[in-house]
């Protein structure tokens, strides 16, 4: 499924503390129902990967193609 990276954005929507992200920015839940199709406005957000929408945070997240990393899958993974 490639590398999964979380966008740093959060609206604090489901968080107890509205000032911080309610989930760690480097982890990703594998449970179904946590993601939906990315809004069309994020069509070009993920550079080398595919976009999915984090339902709990209402924010885009990228699943990187193999060999790419970064929030937007914008960097080549030198260790790949």
């Amino acid at each position: 499924d490639g590398n999964s990276t979380r966008s740093p954005e959060t609206n604090g929507l489901l968080c107890g503390d509205p000032e911080e992200n309610c989930a760690a920015t480097t982890t990703q839940s594998k449970r179904k129902g946590h993601f939906s199709r990315c809004p069309k406005q994020y069509k070009h957000y993920c550079i080398k990967g595919r976009c999915r929408f984090v339902v709990a945070e209402q924010t885009p997240s990228c699943v990187c193609d193999e060999g790419y990393i970064g929030a937007r899958c914008e960097r080549v993974d030198l260790f790949y």
Epitope: N11, P39, Q41
Partner: antibody
């Protein structure tokens, strides 16, 4: 607590330029997308632009594309909107708001008046 | 561009009334819809996101429903502090707001 404070508004002639700033505090600015939303006097809300947390992904409303430029300085916790070739229809209160899709915190707004 | 049409544009109601505001998108937006409340001279406040999820700190008398093109904001029992203008906003394509619905005292 989360605070967004806009500044830089004022009276400008048609064709002129203005630079708005938005100072953020109370949250980790560098982790959030931020937007500009405006409201003409007595009118509704209009989204203007957003910028992602790193400043690499940006979008604009068609009405301002090519004239306005959004940017941010994460070291200063500040968002900017450079407005060029201003028109009478750009007259509005300009709000900065936290988020790219949805806006959960807003500033108090700064008034921009474009008139000769 | 996706156009958002709210109805009615204004309404008069009394404290305790059940109030319903509708928002229609010019094309399907799944559930990418938010609702905001704005009082005169103040910034908007997010009430509902993802069409039906209540934003933290918002009273439970506010609720949202709908998907696709037709959406509804309901205030189950109108309170004095609820007299304001309400906006819907889609965020599937680039963000656009409805024209607003002003809720006034009858």
């Amino acid at each position: 607590q989360v605070q967004l404070l806009e500044s830089g508004g004022g009276l400008v002639q048609p064709g002129g330029s203005l630079r708005l700033s938005c100072a953020a505090s109370g949250f980790t600015f560098s982790r959030y997308w931020i937007s500009w939303v405006r409201q003409a006097p007595g009118k509704g809300l209009e989204w203007v632009s957003y910028i992602d947390s790193t400043g690499t992904f940006i979008n604009y409303a068609d009405s301002v594309k090519g004239r306005f430029t959004i940017s941010r300085d994460n070291s200063k916790n500040t968002l900017y909107l450079q407005m060029n070739s201003l028109r009478a229809e750009d007259t509005a209160v300009y709000y900065c708001a936290r988020g790219g899709s949805l806006f959960d915190y807003w500033g108090q707004g700064t008034l921009v008046t474009v008139s000769s | 561009d996706i156009q958002m049409t709210q109805s009615p544009s204004s309404l008069s109601a009394s404290v305790g009334d059940r109030v319903t505001i509708t928002c229609r998108a010019s094309q399907g937006i799944i559930s990418y819809l938010g609702w905001y409340q704005q009082k005169p001279g103040k910034a908007p406040k997010l009430l509902i996101y993802a069409a039906s999820s209540l934003q933290s700190g918002v009273p439970s008398r506010f609720s949202g429903s709908g998907s696709g093109t037709d959406f509804t904001l309901t205030i189950s029992s109108l309170q004095p502090e609820d007299f304001a203008t309400y906006y819907c906003q889609q965020y599937d394509a680039l963000n656009t707001f409805g024209q607003g619905t002003k809720v006034e005292i009858k």
